[in-house]
Structures are given as C-alpha cells and as structure tokens.
C-alpha cells in the first residue's frame, strides 16, 4: 500500500471550485460531496455560484470528478499501478484539451490535493472557438451521461502519466457530439509515485437534479473502476 | 471566530485613487469567493464587485468596470480593492463580505472612503 | 430589480411584515438581512425561510410568485433596524439589493 492509499480507506469529503471562462462567458462552480475509493464511488453536488451555467453541465463531468479519479477502485491485484492516490497527500496537477467535434475546446489546468482531511479540486477551464448555437452554448445536450472507458499510460519523463478518452454526449435530436480528451497529470510532491502499465478505468455517471435546489446546479453520482490488467501467473497459482 | 477587517479608506479628491484591504480571519479564506458592497451616506446597500475563490474571475458593477480592480492573496488572506478615477458619486462605506455560494453569509464593519475637494 | 416598501411600522409584540417583490422572484432563493444605525449589515434569513444560527427564532421568511416576506413574530424594540432583501442575478450583477425597509417600532 503507498502511503497516498492509506488517505482513502474510509469516506473522504471533497471540495470542487472550477472558475470558467468559455467564448468570454464567465463562470464558477463550487461542488461539495464525498467519495469512497473502497467502492470507487463519488457523490457530488455542484452549484453555479454565478446564476446560470453557460454551457450544459454534462460537458463539465469529466473536468470535476474525472478530476478526482484517486477515488477510483482499484482491484488489489492492480493496487501497484495507482498513480492518483500515490501522489496524495501533496496531490498532482492534472491539464487537459477537450476537443468539441465540429465546435469549440476547453483548456482545463486543476490542482488535486488534500487540505486538512478534504481533498479538494481547484479548477482554472478556458474555452475558445465556440459556436453560439452550436451543441454546447446553444445548450442541445441531453441531461444524461454515459459509460466510458478512460486510459492510462505512464509518462516517465514527467513522473507522471498520460490519459486519454473520448466521451460521447447525446444530443436532443438523437445524436452524439464528441468530445477528445488528452490529460497529463504529474506530481506536486517531491515523493515517489507509482507508474503503471497501461491500462483503463472504467466509469458510471448518472446526472440528478434536487427538487428542492432552485439555483442551477448538477448531482452527480459515480463509479470508478480500474481494471485492464489481469492477474500475474504467481496470482493464478496461490 | 470569522472575522474582516477593513482598511485604506480615507479623504481622496476627485479623480484620485484608493486601495482598500480587507483581512480575513477565523476561516480557510481560500475557499470562499468575496466582494465588495458600498453604502453611500443614508443610502442602501449596492453590490460593488466580486471574485472567485480560485481569484481568476472577477466580477464588477456596471458603475465601477474599469475604473475598480478586486484581487485577492489566498497566501495573506487578504482581499483588496483599488479604485481609481474616483467620482464623488463613489463615496460610501465599503464593505468587504464572504460569499457562501449565492449569497453574502458574514460582512466587516466596513471603512468609510470620501471623494471630495 | 427589487422593491422595498420604505417604511413599515408595528407596536411591540405584534407581527412585523416586510415584502420585497421582482420578477418571477419565487424562482429564486431570496436572502434578508439585518442593519442598525451605524453597524453592518447581519443576515437573518438565507435560502427564502432559513435562519442562521443565532438569530432568533421570532424571524422567518417566505418566498412564492414574484414576493417574498419577512415576518418578524412578536417584534422587540431591539427589531428596529433596516432590512434589505437580496437575491443573485444570471447577469453577473452577482447580488441585488431591495432598496430597504425601515422597521420602526412604535
């Protein structure tokens, strides 16, 4: 077990700030819930602090809690390849490019790391080259997320690792936009961190509203699993 | 307990400027977005600007864009605001408060800024 | 926009009533706070009808339509102070203030 690991054996509670900033729309989020890396679940709840959001909160999933993929589940037989708690409690800085298909791309740089006993999220996203009614600021997504496999390869030369993913967000009409995503992730800390072979996680989101919140806001609910490497020959004969 | 201090108010003539500082105690700063509210002599209260927790995002009234610029040191706990080209129409008592997501949740005491000559 | 009426007054012991009326308002939370001569402002209702710790359970708050209400239940003399209510705006005027309402107790 790393010494990041031991953080997560109960519920941690977790703290998303994000400031936005898509085609000069100027937005911020805060978020609040918890997670349970035992299960490799998430239970968030983000608030636009500005009024409304200006983009659809769909497209902001994997900027907030696939940012905080140390609450992943990973088999014991892949514990080895753990980067995201191993990191912890210094935390590790994760930027990404998130390519819309045929629309505009996000910018994202964020700061994961433990205050206190509080793994906090602090997010700087910048979006550029959007079409007013495209998909994402015309607002044509549907409120629903779907499953996604998301892969991870070591980055030697930085300490760190590389992932990447594509998610696909249905739109009202019946199709899918697109979205490329390429994620960096390296240490803040001077300490050691696992790097891992390569493989994936595996993710469940499902979006929510509470009926009793009148400012624009988003429940998530998630399931992270890591999974993609199987078990060595001295696993299969003990 | 949750504490601001207000500071940096004082006499200014017209097209002066003034930075105000606020310090903040009792809680993690960092984690709160802030602003600033104004009340001019027997008047009511008026929403001056605002930052986010992060500080990259600021946000401003429509009577001060431009002329006011709010920023933060997360390091010093301290929250500022520089004024500049004051009109008489800004003198006021300034209030620095903590924003709990949409609304104001603690305020200082205030310091009162007065732009004549 | 948010209006205020200027003035309202009320004998001791009786029930206080302040409105504050804008646009489809009951859409969004509405947030009262207190200010007596020469101090800041304190809230005393957030999120339409929630009281923070600390605040007399005599202060309550509604909202629906386009009016919400203060309702101060058997009002002290201590109770007379302005009140503002307050709300957020999409418009990235992020608060917006009633005018005020003094509060005087006969």
């Known amino acids: 077990m790393s010494k990041g690991e031991e953080l997560f054996t109960g519920v941690v509670p977790i703290l998303v700030e994000l400031d936005g900033d898509v085609n000069g729309h100027k937005f911020s989020v805060s978020g609040e819930g918890e997670g349970d890396a035992t299960y490799g679940k998430l239970t968030l709840k983000f608030i636009c602090t500005t009024g409304k959001l200006p983009v659809p909160w769909p497209t902001l999933v994997t900027t907030f809690s696939y940012g905080v993929q140390c609450f992943s589940r990973y088999p014991d037989h892949m514990k080895q390849h753990d980067f995201f708690k191993s990191a912890m409690p210094e935390g590790y800085v994760q930027e990404r490019t998130i390519f819309f298909k045929d629309d505009g791309n996000y910018k994202t740089r964020a700061e994961v790391k433990f205050e206190g006993d509080t793994l906090v999220n602090r997010i700087e996203l910048k979006g550029i080259d959007f079409k007013e009614d495209g998909n994402i600021l015309g607002h044509k997504l549907e409120y629903n997320y779907n499953s996604h496999n998301v892969y991870i390869m070591a980055d030697k030369q930085k300490n760190g690792i590389k992932v990447n993913f594509k998610i696909r967000h249905n739109i009202e009409d019946g199709s899918v936009q697109l979205a490329d995503h390429y994620q960096q992730n390296t240490p803040i800390g001077d300490g050691p961190v696992l790097l891992p072979d390569n493989h994936y996680l595996s993710t469940q989101s499902a979006l929510s509203k509470d009926p009793n919140e009148k400012r624009d806001h988003m429940v998530l609910l998630e399931f992270v699993t890591a999974a993609g490497i199987t078990h060595g020959m001295d696993e299969l004969y003990k | 307990q949750v504490q601001l201090v207000e500071s940096g108010g004082g006499l200014v003539q017209p097209g002066g400027s003034l930075r105000l500082s606020c310090a903040a105690s009792?809680?993690?700063?960092?984690?709160?977005?802030m602003h600033w509210v104004r009340q001019a002599p027997g008047k009511g209260l008026e929403w001056v600007s605002g930052?986010?927790?992060?500080?990259?995002?600021?946000y401003y009234a429509d009577s001060v864009k431009g002329r006011f610029t709010i920023s933060r040191d997360n390091s010093k706990n301290t929250l500022y605001l520089q004024m500049n080209s004051l009109r008489a129409e800004d003198t006021a008592v300034y209030y620095c408060?903590?924003?709990?997501?949409?609304?104001?949740?603690?305020w200082g005491q205030g310091t009162l800024v007065t732009v004549s000559s | 926009e948010l209006t205020q009426p200027p003035s309202v007054s009320v004998a001791p012991g009786q029930t206080a009533r302040i409105s504050c009326s804008g646009d489809?308002?009951?859409?969004?939370?509405v947030y009262w706070y207190q200010q007596k001569p020469g101090q800041a402002p304190v809230l005393v209702i957030y999120?339409?009808?929630e009281r923070p710790s600390g605040i007399p359970e005599r202060f309550s708050g509604s909202n629906s339509g386009n009016t919400a209400t203060l309702t101060i239940s058997g009002t002290q003399a201590e109770d007379e102070a302005d009140y503002y209510c307050?709300?957020?705006?999409?418009?990235?005027?992020?608060?917006?203030f009633g005018g005020g309402t003094k509060l005087t107790v006969l």
């Open positions: 930052i986010s927790s992060i500080g990259s995002n600021t």
């Open positions: 307050a709300s957020y705006d999409s418009s990235h005027i992020l608060i917006v």
């Open positions: 999120g339409d009808d």
């Open positions: 009792g809680f993690t700063f960092s984690r709160y977005g």
């Open positions: 408060a903590r924003w709990y997501k949409t609304y104001i949740d603690v």
């Open positions: 489809n308002l009951g859409k969004k939370y």
